[in-house]
């Protein structure tokens, strides 16, 4: 068979699998006269032999790990042993078989990890080697955790990067590891060759001992700082510490205060920089941040709480420059005249703001001094000695000392002596009749004017009239405002009227004075009036309990799952029927009676989340009024979209023949949600048969480079299958095809004779 197993002397390359006993010749070289014999030199290793007649063969199994390429030379000799042709290079490439097991560099590894370390951040690497060809699956290693001890609640705290051997914490490990509970863990790690994919793979194991160290980056206890400190500032009040020295500390004032009286030094000590004033601000909450030397936060900020402790630095203050009270001239001893309420800005319910009252002067002292007394702690003024007479002294002025434990303040009180309250208010009408209103009458509307008169001294508490509704309005839907000059009462709507709960209300008003009546005088029927409020029905639409209902479900919930519910009530008490509007994707159905919402089709976050529909509540019977509310269904992502190419890559070409290995870059994407750092795709060739011609290498989480391994490509289109794995839970893989054409080029573009197939590649490499 000329060509495959025999032929003339020329440079040739042969590929032979290692480990196989010789079963056939490599090549039969044909001699061209005057050549009669052949000679073999080079890296024969006493394995390769050429017979004088030109038969090249090998006499025992090859070992790629000893020599992966044998560079031989064959020369043709004449009858005198003189080289007449060659020597020509003959290359024997030894192809790999999986005849070596992976071995860990260490039988035991030790490492430490800090509690609350960032998930996925490597803290230890295990490393194995395999003498087989790393460009083939035989030398491609796959690491996994066989067991974690102890295993608490079946939760893995550690994870390993299958390719690099990097060990890091899982999210659960980051949250739950605690050296106080479990200071050490042991992992058994396995490594397999064949990328872990074959039953025939070799493996090895190693042990990893992990110490969990305490995370000292913790919020300190709340600090109490006394206000108005006279000590030299700054004063250290607390501290934070990163787990290593050299962190760059800063404070963040979330409240954006005009003055922020705290600082932090490079050791993490926190200071108050100036005296604090509790009355200005009684507590501060701010954050301590630790950054690395590159300016990146090392961890979450810590919340610092500072409570400002009160000192007695505020005197009592009077409620007004002069406080005015009235007293009737025949009031009895002990009657209350009024209460002086002074204030103190110091902390409530402490000795610093606890006030004492004392009368220090009365003018005039007629008919005698000491006519009034004040309750020491309550500030209530009382008549102490006798009744007063308006014609003798119509007005008294008191000076009252108000004191806390350190300060004294003088307050001034004016007491006006007024006529006795011996006249009661009298309504001009005892019955204001019936009033009919629709239940939707506006709040704030005045619906009735009432009037009573009082013959006591004008513009005093004895003649002033206050109106109260004492019956018929337990819901407090109505109120009465009084005009202080005319004592006219205006009845207003304070809350919505409601036919359904109060169609008819029999309202009773009472007219009273703020001043007490003299002994023996009582309010009688003249001080009472009534009216009847009739509320007419307005048919109202059902009312939803919320404007927007929101629910959250995973996008992969089973059909028929309850995903939410809505509730509405009809003011008239009619039954309600629920329906959906705007369910454009046909994903949902609603139970007409209960308002429960169910999925009726597969949900898909990638089609849009939240999914917004309207829910309609309609009266059953009556005038069938309806209301509309929103239902927003937030779909939580599951990894249900395999990676794909980010764009159309038709038209990729290399100019043939290749002068050097070439490469092209492609981008992958998928439609799932990628929080924080974006996708983390891994790339590999889609089938083993591509390994000899192509290589794919990751650039970052979304981009990879496809490179040729050699330059010996035919002038045709190659379809390169690429496997893209998203590393999700569960991991999804997409197999995509990149069509790459090797073509003759004219001025850097593919040349196609006229009439050749369409679809000319347009992207040169």
């Amino acid at each position: 068979q000329e060509g495959k197993f025999s032929g003339p002397l020329k440079p040739m390359t042969f590929s032979i699998y290692e480990g196989q006993e010789p079963s056939q010749i490599i090549f039969q070289f044909k001699a061209n006269p005057p050549a009669v014999t052949f000679e073999l030199t080079g890296e024969t290793d006493n394995i390769f032999v050429i017979e004088r007649e030109g038969l090249l063969y090998y006499n025992r199994a090859l070992d790629r790990e000893t020599r992966s390429t044998h560079n031989l030379q064959v020369a043709a000799l004449d009858a005198n042993g003189i080289i007449v042709e060659g020597p020509v290079p003959i290359t024997i490439k030894v192809k790999d078989i999986n005849d070596n097991r992976p071995t860990f560099l260490q039988s035991k590894y030790e490492g430490s990890v800090r509690q609350n370390s960032r998930p996925g951040k490597p803290f230890l690497y295990v490393n194995a080697t395999d003498l087989d060809d790393p460009a083939t699956p035989n030398g491609q290693l796959y690491y996994q955790i066989v067991i974690q001890l102890p295993m608490i609640n079946n939760v893995m705290y550690f994870q390993i990067n299958n390719k690099t051997g990097a060990i890091s914490l899982t999210r659960e490990g980051s949250q739950e590891l605690n050296p106080a509970k479990n200071p050490s863990y042991n992992l058994v790690i396995s490594v397999k060759d064949m990328g872990g994919q074959s039953e025939n793979s070799f493996s090895d194991t190693t042990s990893v001992d992990i110490i969990v160290t305490e995370n000292i980056w913790k919020a300190p206890k709340p600090v109490e700082m006394v206000e108005n400190s006279t000590d030299p500032h700054p004063i250290k009040i607390t501290q934070v510490r990163w787990n290593d020295p050299g962190a760059q500390y800063s404070l963040v004032d979330k409240e954006k205060l005009p003055r922020f009286p705290f600082s932090i030094d490079q050791e993490g000590d926190i200071y108050v920089t100036q005296p604090l004033d509790r009355e200005e601000k009684d507590a501060y909450v701010f954050y301590a941040v630790a950054k690395d030397e590159y300016g990146k936060p090392l961890s979450y900020p810590l919340e610092i709480h500072v409570k400002v402790k009160d000192i007695n630095d505020n005197p009592p203050t009077c409620p007004s420059p002069v406080t005015v009270f009235e007293v009737q001239e025949n009031e009895r001893l002990g009657n209350s005249i009024g209460t002086l309420t002074a204030h103190d800005r110091d902390e409530e319910n402490t000795a610093n703001s606890f006030l004492n009252y004392r009368i220090v002067e009365q003018t005039p002292k007629l008919p005698m001094d000491g006519l009034f007394l004040i309750q020491t702690y309550a500030g209530m003024l009382q008549l102490a000695k006798q009744s007063l007479k308006k014609q003798d002294t119509p007005q008294y002025n008191l000076t009252i000392e108000v004191s806390d434990k350190d300060f004294k303040t003088l307050c001034f009180v004016q007491i006006n002596v007024i006529d006795i309250n011996d006249q009661i208010p009298i309504f001009e009408k005892s019955d204001y009749g019936n009033l009919t209103l629709a239940e939707d009458t506006n709040i704030g509307s005045t619906i009735l004017t009432i009037q009573a008169t009082d013959a006591d001294e004008p513009f005093t508490g004895s003649s002033k009239i206050l109106y109260h509704i004492i019956k018929g309005d337990s819901e407090g839907r109505l109120g009465v405002d009084t005009d202080p000059h005319t004592n006219t009462g205006y009845v207003i709507i304070k809350k919505p009227l409601d036919f359904e709960t109060a169609a008819v209300s029999n309202i009773v008003f009472k007219a009273e004075n703020p001043e007490p009546l003299v002994f023996g005088v009582k309010y009688n029927a003249s001080s009472f009036a009534k009216f009847t409020l009739i509320v007419t029905d307005v048919n109202e639409a059902p009312q939803f309990s919320q404007h927007v209902f929101q629910a959250k479900v995973s996008e992969d919930v089973a059909i028929g799952t309850k995903v939410g519910n809505v509730t509405a009530k009809d003011p008239e008490g009619l039954d309600i029927s629920y329906s959906l509007r705007g369910d454009t994707r046909g994903w949902l159905k609603i139970d007409h009676v209960t308002g429960e919402i169910f999925s009726v089709a597969p949900l898909d976050r990638e089609a849009g989340s939240p999914y917004r529909v309207q829910v309609v509540a309609t009266e059953v019977g009556g005038s069938s009024l309806s209301s509309v509310s929103e239902f927003h269904l937030i779909l939580m992502d599951v990894n249900d979209n395999p990676p794909r190419l980010a764009k159309d890559y038709t038209g990729l070409f290399f100019c043939h023949p290749l002068s050097a290995p070439g490469s092209l870059i492609f981008e992958a994407t998928d439609d799932d949600q990628h929080l924080f750092r974006g996708p983390h795709f891994t790339f590999s060739l889609g089938s083993g048969s591509l390994q000899n011609d192509w290589e794919v290498s990751k650039i970052n989480g979304t981009h990879a480079r496809l490179s040729t391994r050699h330059t010996e490509f035919e002038e045709r289109e190659y379809v390169v299958l690429i496997r893209i794995n998203d590393g999700g839970r569960p991991p999804l893989e997409g197999i995509v095809s990149l069509p790459v054409t090797f073509c003759s080029c004219v001025e850097g573009s593919c040349f196609r004779p006229a009439g050749h197939q369409t679809g000319i590649p347009t992207v040169g490499m």
Partner: antibody, heavy 119, light 112 residues
Framework: AVQLQQSGPELLKPGASVKISCKAS????????MHWVKQSHGKSLEWIGG????????SYNETFKDKATLTVDKSSNTAYMELRSLTSEDSAVYYC????????????WGQGTSVTVSS | DIVMSQSPSSLTVSVGEKVTMSCKSS????????????LAWYQQKPGQSPKLLIS???TRESGVPDRFTGSGSGTDFTLTISSVKAEDLADYYC????????FGGGTKLEIK
């Protein structure tokens, strides 16, 4: 095995700039920070600065802030240091060295790049 | 900045002898929050780049012979070679990594 392969020696004129490279292999480039150290002939070591390859954040010795600029190219696992406005004082061997994130020593060093500044 | 001082600047010993070299820092390198000392020792043989010998003041790196011992606390540190071999001819540098990084001036070890 971890390797830090630095670019070759440089002979430059005063006032020139130079960019030396350090190609990392045998480990995950973004899992370690890369630092640069100067050693003048017969002298001790001086820390110049470091860079976080993940996002390019830098940290400099104040002495070198106006002299050196550190950058990385994640796609080629290579760190660079550019030295500007060169004088004879800048003649030295410059080393790159990796440090795990945090406060750790320099566990692997490049072979060094000799920079000679001469008119 | 933390300043590191080494002494002596050079010393000459015979093979088999014990040698100690000193390193002082201008401030304590002990971080009280975790009780770690942020000091390393490096060996630089002629024509080579520095090699990490000891971290955390006393932890030998893997592959470093046990004749090398680091000790000290706070501000005063010592590197001891219990029985010098010819291959130990090198410059030895201490370095703090407590805040940024600074090296000592070095100690040149020569063999008689």
């Amino acid at each position: 095995a971890v390797q830090l392969q630095q670019s070759g020696p440089e002979l430059l004129k005063p006032g020139a700039s130079v960019k030396i490279s350090c190609k990392a292999s045998g480990y995950t480039f973004t899992d370690y920070t890369m630092h640069w150290v100067k050693q003048s002939h017969g002298k001790s070591l001086e820390w110049i600065g470091g860079i976080n390859p993940n996002y390019g954040g830098t940290s400099y010795n104040e002495t070198f802030k106006d002299k050196a600029t550190l950058t990385v190219d994640k796609s080629s696992n290579t760190a660079y240091m550019e030295l500007r406005s060169l004088t004879s004082e800048d003649s030295a061997v410059y080393y790159c060295a990796r440090i795990p994130y945090g406060s750790y020593p320099m566990d692997y060093w490049g072979q060094g790049t000799s920079v000679t500044v001469s008119s | 900045d933390i300043v590191m001082s080494q002494s002596p600047s050079s010393l000459t010993v015979s093979v088999g002898e014990k040698v100690t070299m000193s390193c002082k820092s201008s401030q304590s390198l002990l971080y009280s929050s975790n009780q770690k000392i942020y000091l390393a020792w490096y060996q630089q043989k002629p024509g080579q780049s520095p090699k990490l010998l000891i971290s955390w003041a006393s932890t030998r790196e893997s592959g470093v012979p046990d004749r090398f011992t680091g000790s000290g606390s706070g501000t005063d540190f010592t590197l001891t070679i219990s029985s010098v071999k010819a291959e130990d001819l090198a410059d030895y540098y201490c370095q703090q990594y407590y805040r940024y990084r600074t090296f000592g001036g070095g100690t040149k070890l020569e063999i008689k």
